[in-house]
């Protein structure tokens, strides 16, 4: 799978994580920081 950094317009897309662009899947993906989950890393869990 080809990946690259997200475009600048997606700054802030991932609330608590790193935004990755999955080129072949035509979508952005959030790699969440430890303790966070959700499509956009918007949920905190213990």
């Amino acid at each position: 799978v080809s990946i690259t950094k997200c475009n600048s317009d997606m700054n802030g897309y991932c609330l608590h994580g790193q935004c990755i662009y999955l080129v072949d899947m035509s979508q952005n993906y959030c790699r969440c920081e430890v303790g966070y989950t959700g499509v956009r890393c918007e949920h905190f869990y213990l």
Epitope: V23, N28, V39
Partner: antibody, heavy 116, light 106 residues
Framework: QDQLVQSGAEVKKPGASVKVSCKAS????????IQWVRQAPGQGLEWMGR????????KYREKFEGRVTITADTSTNTAYMELSSLRSEDTAVYYC?????????WGQGTLVTVSS | RIQMTQSPSSLSASVGDRVTITCKAS??????IAWYQQKPGQAPRLLIQ???TLQPGVPSRFSGSGSGTDYTFTISSLQPEDIATYYC????????FGGGTKVEIK
Amino acid sequence: QDQLVQSGAEVKKPGASVKVSCKASGFNIKDTYIQWVRQAPGQGLEWMGRIDPLRGNTKYREKFEGRVTITADTSTNTAYMELSSLRSEDTAVYYCVRSGTLFDFWGQGTLVTVSS
Amino acid sequence: RIQMTQSPSSLSASVGDRVTITCKASQDIHKYIAWYQQKPGQAPRLLIQYTSTLQPGVPSRFSGSGSGTDYTFTISSLQPEDIATYYCLQYDNLRTFGGGTKVEIK
């Protein structure tokens, strides 16, 4: 199956406002950005602005600043585009477009006609 | 705001011809360019995103290339069903469409 279903065609008088809705099904709009694009008859595609429904943040093209308002109601999974002070040049098909989790998934379009 | 200059605005070519459309951005858009096909009365159809990534179901005669500010869209062998208007879109920083290229059969 993911869908963006837009409200029906509208006819408005110059100076009036129009509010177009875009209801999502099959996915949560909070996971996406919703863009709005318009196309006047026989003309090209024109980006108007977008909303991040999760945060409520909006960005607008400069030429529409002050005249367009994009909102989202996450409880009904619906985005809206309101354009005020309509003039004949605003006659166009208005599209909502999902981006973020999937690159550019389009609604069917809503024809807005401005005529006295 | 990033400007996208698309050329030519229209072209006429024969079936089987190679067709090339270019888009020039006013600043580096880091390969974040997409290409759409639009036929009369229809919504735009995404053909290519991220400069060269073909969408599922799109024929391999369509291709894209470029980097920095200069990008190219190519139809290697024009078919009658390719008659349409084509648009580039930069999506690096907000969004801007090119002016479109109307492709006709000679």
